[in-house]
Each structure stands twice: as C-alpha cells, then as structure tokens.
C-alpha cells in the first residue's frame, strides 16, 4: 500500500487525497490537515508547517474534522421552546435536545428549534405511533375493532373492550369505539326497556 502523503503538500488540481481530514489552502496552493473533532486551528498551515490544533475550551465544541479558528459555544436546551436535554455538550458534540413529553417539533433548522403541544385525539381515536417521538404532530386514527378510547387526549391509547364472560358476567351493552362494553351480573333483572320481553 502507498504511504500517506504528509501535509502540507502541493496540489495543482485543488483537491486533497483525504477530503475528510485535509483541506485545500488556496493562498499557498497546498493541502493541509484539518483539526480533529474537539479541537480548532490555533495556527494556520503554511508551505513549511502543517496546521496546529488545540483542544476546545470548556463549554465549547467542534463536531467534525475542521479548519475553524474557534470552537462553537455550547448552548443549553431552551425549555421556553419546549426542549429538554438528553445528552450534555462535550468538546466533540453539541448538547443533544428533544421535545418535552406531550410536545412535537414544530420548527426544524438542521435540528429542532421549537416544540408545540401535541393535538388531542378525540374519543374513538388514538395517535398513530411514530418511529421517533416528538418528530411530528399527532395523526389520529380510529380505534380498531374491539377497542375503545373515551377521552380527548394527545397520548391515550385505544384499549380492548372488556370481555364480560372472563369476569363471570354477561354483556349488558356492547362496546363502541368510544365506550367499553357494559357488563352485568347474570342474575340481575333486565333493564327496564327490556322488561316484558320474555324469551321462552
């Protein structure tokens, strides 16, 4: 295998062999090293000397191989914008934020900048499950057969109808999408509206 070129090295076509870890410096027409994540350029390269890197100070970071002369300032997750922290800032990574429970990301610019309350799903529906929590507003879907949901809520799930026989009871009224099955003791009299009807 061919040995690696040692920066700085001349580049006539303005491209470098390792695009991730090197960059073209047009003033000197050379390829120089980028600084690794967690560092910044403390001295720019020349035809003689390669880039000199230094570690980012506390509360600052650079996430990628870079030729930045400063580190980015760590920013807290803004609770006013509905955000909460899931991982702290390090020299190599910015603070990781997500929407607070019951909220979704309403504004996205490379990352979430503003969260809003999830919409309620009306009785008889539930929020469709998403791959990533907080990614979008609720999309309400009807409860599937044999299930119900009886509140207006952003997070309530459809529950299976009660099976009266499992409790030694009998069905008094069938369940709907918005209500559970009504059960009664088998020895109880029929409801008033059913009195007078005798089954022989």
């Amino acid at each position: 295998s061919q040995p690696q070129a040692v920066p700085p090295y001349a580049s006539e076509n303005q491209t470098c062999r390792d695009q991730e870890k090197e960059y073209y410096e047009p003033q000197h027409r050379i390829c120089c090293s980028r600084c690794p994540p967690g560092t910044y350029v403390s001295a720019k390269c020349s035809r003689i000397r390669d880039t000199v890197c230094a570690t980012c100070a506390e509360n600052s970071y650079n996430e990628h191989w870079n030729y930045l002369t400063i580190c980015q300032l760590c920013r807290p997750c803004d609770p006013v914008m509905g955000l909460e922290e899931i991982a702290p800032c390090t020299s190599k990574r910015k603070t990781q934020c997500r929407c607070q429970p019951g909220m979704f990301c309403a504004a996205w610019a490379l990352e979430c900048t503003h969260c809003e309350l999830l919409s309620d799903c009306p009785p008889g529906t539930e929020a469709e499950l998403k791959d990533e929590v907080g990614k979008g507003n609720n999309h309400c879907v009807p409860c599937k057969a044999g299930h119900f949901q009886n509140t207006s809520s952003p997070s309530a799930r459809c529950q299976p109808h009660t099976r009266c026989e499992n409790q030694g009871l009998v069905e008094a009224a069938p369940g709907t999408a918005q209500s559970d099955t009504t059960c009664k003791n088998p020895l109880e009299p029929l409801p008033p509206e059913m009195s007078g009807t005798m089954l022989m």
């Epitope: 690696q4 700085p8 020349s46």
Partner: antibody
Framework: QVQLQESGPGLVKPSETLSLTCTVS??????YYWSWIRLPPGKGLEWI?????????NYNPSLKSRVSMSVDTSKNQFSLKLSYVTAADTAVYYC?????????????WGQGTLVIVSS | DIQMTQSPSSLSASLGDRVTITCQAS??????LIWYQLKPGKAPKVLIY???NLETGVPSRFSGSGSGTDFTFTISSLQPEDIATYYC?????????FGQGTRLDIK
C-alpha cells in the same frame, strides 16, 4: 529524531563520476522529498536537485545534464551521481529531507561530506 | 531562476551586539523564505521559516521579517555560539536558490 549520513569517496578524478549515498535513520524514507545541496569552497550553497520517495526527480537546470538521483526504500537510502566532474565540482555535499510531502524546505540535513575533484 | 542577493558577505561584531543581515529576491517570493545556520562539520540548521517564524527550539534572540522581495534576519544579542555562516533560501519556485551567505565572526 531523523538523522542523515552522507557517504562516498572523498576524492574523484576529473571526468569521472562522483557517487554519494545518503543513509536515513530514525524515520522512513517514504512520503518525503530528499535533496542534495553542495557548498563549494569560498562560494554559497547550491541546490543540486531532489528525488521523491516514489522516484520522481527535479534537478537544477545548471547541472541537469550531468545529474542522476535514485532511491532505495528497502535500504532507507538515496543516492547522487554527478558525471564528468571538474575541479569546479569540489565541494561539501549535503543530503537533506523536506518538512513534509512537498519540496519547499529542508528540515533535516546531514553533516556533509567533502568531495575533492583532483587528478 | 530567482536570484537571492544577501548582504553583507561577512561581518564582525562584538558579543551582545545586534546583528542584521538582509536578503533581496529578484522577484516577489511572498514569505517563502528560510534562514539557515551553517557551522563547519555540523548539520545545517533551520532558524527561521516562512520569513518570520522561529523554528522550534531556536533561541528567541533570532528573528526574521519581510515579505515580497526584501527580508531581514536579526540576532538581537550576539552570543559566542552564533559564530557561523547564515544563508537565506527561497522556496517560491524551483529551482531552489540560496543567498551567497554571510560569514559572522567576533570582533
């Protein structure tokens, strides 16, 4: 620390070929440019040329017709041949290594070896 | 080829003196200039690169300045170990060329 050591005959007859070798220790010959520079008595430094570890060369136009350089990566050596020498080629000959994978400057030099051209 | 004119060719100075050497390029070489120190029987040493940057491990009494065609090398306070010959070298274009050298000795 990289060290360079020139070696070869200290006396060469006129019209013959001067042959010098530079042995590199404390580092690989790969990835760098390797130069020969000379200092004739009472004169200034003169760049003879360079060879890249891969074999590509560039010679001073004033000496180009008489100069040949080669590299042996397995031995960590590179060499200079200067043909049809005259008394004007009497000098201290230095070998040197570039800072990086570019020819721009010589960071490491040997101590030099004196070559006298005389019959 | 780029001609490098160095002056003076020799100079005598007393210990503690400020010593200045100049180097002039025949065309603009930006800041692509090195100053070397040569002592007999020793490996030449880089003192200044990029016209004004001090090489690692070189005492701070050595300095360089200039850009374009005119360059200056200074020893702020001459020490006994500074007795040597000094050369400028351009690395703007091939062929690499050197100044004629300045031989420095003690008065």
């Amino acid at each position: 620390q990289v060290q360079l050591q020139e070696s070869g005959p200290g006396l060469v007859k006129p019209s013959e070929t001067l042959s010098l070798t530079c042995t590199v220790s404390g580092g690989s010959i790969s990835s760098y440019y390797w130069s020969w520079i000379r200092l004739p008595p009472g004169k200034g430094l003169e760049w003879i040329g360079y060879i890249y570890y891969g074999g590509s060369t560039n010679y001073n136009p004033s000496l180009k017709s008489r100069v040949s350089m080669s590299v042996d990566t397995s031995k960590n050596q590179f060499s200079l041949k200067l043909s049809y020498v005259t008394a004007a080629d009497t000098a201290v000959y230095y070998c040197a290594r570039s800072y990086s994978s570019a020819w721009y400057g010589s960071a490491y030099w040997g101590q030099g070896t004196l070559v006298i051209v005389s019959s | 080829d780029i001609q490098m004119t160095q002056s003076p060719s020799s100079l005598s100075a007393s210990l503690g003196d400020r010593v200045t050497i100049t180097c002039q390029a025949s065309q603009d070489i930006s800041n692509y200039l090195i100053w070397y120190q040569l002592k007999p029987g020793k490996a030449p040493k880089v003192l200044i690169y990029d016209a004004s940057n001090l090489e690692t491990g070189v005492p701070s009494r050595f300095s360089g300045s200039g850009s374009g065609t005119d360059f200056t090398f200074t020893i702020s306070s001459l020490q006994p170990e500074d007795i040597a010959t000094y050369y400028c070298q351009q690395y703007d274009h091939l062929p690499i060329t050197f100044g004629q050298g300045t031989r420095l000795d003690i008065k």
